[in-house]
């Protein structure tokens, strides 16, 4: 049987054979992959990149959250959507997950001018069906998925908006465990609206196998701030394995080459 994919840290600290990032299959060896380092001064301003419109993001809900063995994932089940932001159509929210380390300098997947952040939050959306502009695009869409990526850094205050998620982590230490979060809205997790005006945009891939190259990425310039203990909770409470021997951390794909692609900014 073929080994399952994993992160480098899992291979280093477990006896189970698994495929580390350099050996990931599927589309993962192609040339339009994510994440990337964004050189902020090289990104050209594009006037078409306007503000985002968030629908359902403000609604208080009791979200299901699970440990899927790779990250912690909130199931959004089309209960929210986005439009604007230079996107070609509305996109429905599917899931939210995060990437992190146990140190402040290396938990994000994307980097800005070579700098990594403590964490990175991805809100994954799918394009509403029947909204592709032509047949070619409908068959081979490079923007079927829209991911909003938020960098996370340490601040001095507890971020109350994240507390329902952070508090739920204790209930899902092992893979395949799920729980219900205390009532919260997606908006609670985001920076204030004025901080969402500045972002970077490029076309890339999913950052986990099968690394499909059908993602329109939005990486926001302004980071979310979480308290130290909120950030550390992710690596302290969650495990990759059912035996709870390998702490979930460093679930970060290495940077990929930008190649011929361009990054634009709002």
């Amino acid at each position: 049987a073929e080994s399952h994919w994993c992160y480098e840290v899992q291979a280093e600290s477990s006896n189970y054979p698994c495929l580390v990032p350099v050996k990931w299959g599927g589309n993962c060896q192609k040339d339009r992959q994510s994440p990337i380092n964004i050189v902020t001064t090289k990104a050209k301003v594009d006037k078409k990149l306007g503000r985002f419109f968030f629908s359902g993001y403000d609604k208080k809900q009791t979200w299901t959250v699970q440990n899927n063995g790779h990250s912690v994932m909130m199931l959004l089940e089309n209960k929210a959507s986005i439009s604007g932001g230079g996107l070609p159509a509305p996109y429905q929210a599917k899931q939210l997950h995060l990437h992190w380390s146990d140190l402040p300098y290396k938990g994000s997947e994307h980097s800005l001018d070579g700098e990594h952040f403590a964490m990175e939050m991805h809100i994954v959306h799918e394009k509403e069906k029947g909204t592709s502009r032509n047949v070619k695009e409908a068959q081979d869409p490079e923007d079927e998925i829209a991911v909003l990526a938020f960098l996370v850094e340490a601040g001095t205050q507890v971020n109350e908006g994240f507390q329902p998620l952070v508090e739920a982590l204790s209930n899902i230490p092992k893979p395949e465990m799920s729980t219900t979060m205390a009532e919260s809205s997606l908006l609670d997790l985001l920076p204030k609206e004025e901080k969402l005006r500045h972002y970077f945009r490029y076309l890339g891939s999913l950052t986990t196998p099968t690394c499909d190259e059908k993602v329109v990425w939005t990486v926001f310039r302004e980071p979310i701030q979480l308290h130290r203990e909120q950030i550390l909770a992710f690596s302290q409470k969650l495990y990759y394995d059912k035996e709870q021997t390998v702490s979930m951390k460093d679930n970060v794909r290495p940077l990929q080459q930008l190649g011929q692609r361009t990054v634009i900014k709002s």
């Epitope: 380390s101 146990d102 140190l103 402040p104 300098y105 700098e115 990594h116 403590a118 850094e153 340490a154 601040g155 001095t156 308290h227 130290r228 203990e229 950030i231 550390l232 690596s235 302290q236 702490s247 951390k249």
Partner: antibody
Framework: DVQLVESGAELVRPGTSMKMSCKAS????????IEWIKQRPGQGLEWIGV????????HYNEKFKDKATLTADKSSSTAYMQLSSLTSDDSAVYFC????????????WGQGTTLTVSS | QIQITQSPAILSVSPGERVSFSCRAS??????IHWYQQRTNGSPRLLIK???ESISGIPSRFSGSGSGTDFTLSINSVESEDIAVYYC?????????FGAGTKLELK
């Protein structure tokens, strides 16, 4: 009261290794990162690296990654730094410090360990 | 990595005078600068965090200001116990870096 107490001064031969310690008290050891900083005589401060005592995760200044190895023992609330292949350039005072915010300033410092490398 | 420049290297003052230390970063770092005092044969002591935030137990004569690339630490009435080297440190980008320090001495 938060305290970081470092091991005593050491005189060692070139080419050898040595391990210094930093015992923490007065706070939850696993909740704060421990940094190590080098200060050569009459010189400024140079950041060596950092350890998360809760997980053992480390991060090094590129300049020191082949020189220093950071470890921590949760049971004794003690952080350690091993320095290898010592030369006269390694003669310095080495401080451990607690990182006050995650990835930020050092709010409490040890008294320093003086290392002299000489034949 | 971000370079931190402190000036002047040495400051000579009389007790009771107001004194200011300058710290300049090679690129904008918001307010992520911290100031330390190191007396002879002692350990650094945190005086000011995030450019202007005071630290419990530090005398009120110490204050900080600035943002972006230019920062200042001030002592509004120098006392003899303030004789020390003063360092600034940036925590905006890894690896964190310190200035070379400014030595405060009495005239």
């Amino acid at each position: 009261d938060v305290q970081l107490v470092e091991s005593g001064a050491e005189l060692v031969r070139p080419g050898t290794s040595m391990k210094m310690s930093c015992k923490a008290s007065g706070y939850a050891f696993t909740n704060y990162l421990i940094e190590w900083i080098k200060q050569r005589p009459g010189q400024g401060l140079e950041w060596i690296g950092v350890i998360n005592p809760g997980s053992g995760g480390t991060h090094y200044n590129e300049k020191f990654k082949d020189k220093a190895t950071l470890t921590a023992d949760k049971s004794s609330s003690t952080a350690y730094m091993q320095l290898s292949s010592l030369t006269s350039d390694d003669s310095a005072v080495y401080f451990c410090a607690r990182e006050g915010d995650y990835g930020s300033r050092a709010d409490y410092w040890g008294q320093g360990t003086t290392l002299t490398v000489s034949s | 990595q971000i370079q931190i420049t402190q000036s002047p290297a040495i400051l000579s003052v009389s007790p009771g005078e107001r004194v200011s230390f300058s710290c300049r970063a090679s690129q904008s770092i918001g307010t992520r600068i911290h100031w330390y005092q190191q007396r002879t044969n002692g350990s650094p002591r945190l005086l000011i965090k995030y450019a202007s935030e005071s630290i419990s137990g530090i005398p009120s004569r110490f204050s900080g200001s600035g943002s972006g690339t230019d920062f200042t630490l001030s002592i509004n009435s120098v006392e003899s116990e303030d004789i020390a080297v003063y360092y600034c440190q940036q925590s905006n980008s890894w690896p964190t870096t310190f200035g070379a320090g400014t030595k405060l001495e009495l005239k």
